[in-house]
Interface confidence: low
């Protein structure tokens, strides 16, 4: 349930097969409508989100993809997207979330007992950004039509992170969004860890603080990919 | 083929109890979440309950928060809804579902007839 | 919780007919929109998601539109199996609800 999350942003809650997937939320991912990807028609600033600059979609976390942020945009600036999840539009397998690949258009799953079922026909639909909004909804939130005055506190339901305290960020839990703490120096965050664990838990931490980013910690450099751990250090 | 088949409805008295079961065949279960949906006679669907993959989250309408807990054994790839504190308003056809995509019920069970009445 | 508001709750049709159905959420919603036809007696049927998108194994004369909070389930040439009950569902936020239904008679 959502207390469960309520106090912090470790990932405590996930079954060993999501554990190590640095919290990152499997085949079910749901990506909110906001900066848009070549195929939308609209496109939403970043509320108090520092958006993570990439070159390539290693750079991403295991639900994210490297994409220009804006419809047709500079292919230099890109960012780190919220991955597709089954059934949306893709035109790379990097876009789909972990446990699905591109085929013909769609996210489909790369496990084929999941459901057994021909793809369903194309639709055109926006790219969306899982770290802001647009026409002020969210894809998964419990937040009701009438806005807070008062900024959320932690565990407070938020659509994005300006509407949460200082000190805080929106970050999702399963088929909401609440108010987490920002991360300090030295937690554990998650970054550059690739596709390949399902699940339908979403227990998303918040990003590093001010002069902070989310880097392998020093002494594992050595550590193999799938057990890299990162946490946020100074730039 | 994607089955599922609901079983445990029957006539309860208001203030009983009563545990429906969904086996799930035709596809990885504990991969997906399930969802409990839920039809009074002559009347429209309504959302009960949702349960994610592994069990570790769970989710409830209002209108059942407190009285009925949703649960899953992937080992039996079985669904599970215990409700207790029956109200003559939870008499209604209750369906299993889940989905390909988390966004729909592609799936949906035959449905079992829950009836408390006295 | 959202609402959602189906029109009209039922109607009369003839085969070959062009039947509509509209939607209405009380907060935007995307399209995150599904429609489902419901048969006595039977489980719900998945019919169109995201608003637009046909359901694998649905015939072509189903389409839906609409974004936001306005949407609409067109039938372009009523068929004597597509007198049913028809339900609109939203999945932008958690819970999911149901539109009341719209019965589709025989005229």
């Known amino acids: 349930t959502l207390n469960s999350v309520l106090n912090s942003n470790a990932i405590k809650n996930l079954p060993p097969p999501l554990g190590g997937a640095a919290g990152h939320p499997g085949s079910a991912v749901s990506a909110a409508p906001g900066i848009l990807y070549p195929g939308g028609n609209k496109y939403q600033t970043i509320d108090n989100y520092q958006p993570y600059p990439c070159a390539e979609d290693e750079e991403c976390g295991t639900d994210e993809y490297c994409a220009s942020p804006t419809r047709g945009g500079d292919a230099g600036v890109q960012i780190c997207l919220a991955c597709r999840k089954r059934r949306k539009r893709c035109m790379r397998h990097a876009m789909c979330c972990p446990g699905n690949y591109c085929k013909n258009g769609i996210c489909v799953s790369s496990d084929q007992n999941h459901f057994r079922g021909e793809i369903e026909e194309t639709i055109t639909e926006s790219f969306g950004n899982d770290h802001s909004t647009l026409d002020g909804y969210s894809r998964r939130t419990t937040l009701s039509s009438k806005m807070y005055h008062t900024k959320g506190q932690e565990g407070s339901v938020c659509l994005r992170s300006s509407d949460c305290a200082s000190g805080l960020c929106c970050a999702r839990h399963f088929w909401s969004k609440i108010c987490k703490p920002v991360l300090k120096e030295g937690q554990v965050c998650t970054k550059h860890r690739r596709k390949g664990s399902h699940g339908l838990e979403i227990f998303q931490r918040c990003y590093c603080g001010e002069g902070l980013s989310c880097r392998i910690q020093k002494d594992h450099h050595q550590a193999s990919n799938s057990s890299r751990l990162h946490t946020c250090q100074r730039h | 083929e994607v089955q599922l088949l609901e079983s445990g409805g029957g006539l309860v008295q208001p203030g009983g109890s009563l545990r429906l079961s969904c086996a799930a065949s035709?596809?990885?279960?504990?991969?997906?979440?399930m969802s409990w949906v839920r039809q009074a006679p002559g009347k429209g669907l309504e959302w009960v309950s949702a349960?994610?993959?592994?069990?570790?989250?769970?989710y409830y309408a209002d209108s059942v928060k407190g009285r009925f807990t949703i649960s899953r054994d992937n080992s039996k790839n079985t669904l599970y809804l215990q409700m207790n504190s029956l109200r003559a308003e939870d008499t209604a056809v209750y369906y299993c579902?889940?989905?390909?995509?988390?966004?729909?019920?592609?799936?949906w069970g035959q449905g079992t007839l829950v009836t408390v009445s006295s | 919780d959202i609402q959602m508001t189906q029109s009209p709750s039922s109607l009369s049709a003839s085969v070959g007919d062009r039947v509509t159905i509209t939607c209405r959420a009380s907060?935007?919603?995307?399209?995150?929109l599904n429609w489902y036809q419901q048969k006595p007696g039977k489980a719900p049927k998945l019919l169109i998601y995201a608003a637009s998108g046909l359901q694998s194994g649905v015939p072509s004369r189903f389409s839906g539109s609409g974004s936001g909070t306005d949407f609409t389930l067109t039938i372009s040439s009523l068929q004597p199996e597509d007198f049913a009950t028809y339900y609109c569902?939203?999945?932008?936020?958690?819970?999911?609800?149901f539109g009341q239904g719209t019965k589709v008679e025989i005229k």
């Open positions: 349960i994610t993959g592994s069990g570790g989250s769970t």
């Open positions: 035709g596809f990885t279960f504990d991969q997906y979440d």
């Open positions: 579902a889940t989905a390909e995509s988390d966004d729909t019920y592609d799936y």
């Open positions: 907060q935007t919603i995307g399209d995150y």
């Open positions: 569902q939203q999945s932008n936020s958690w819970p999911y609800t």
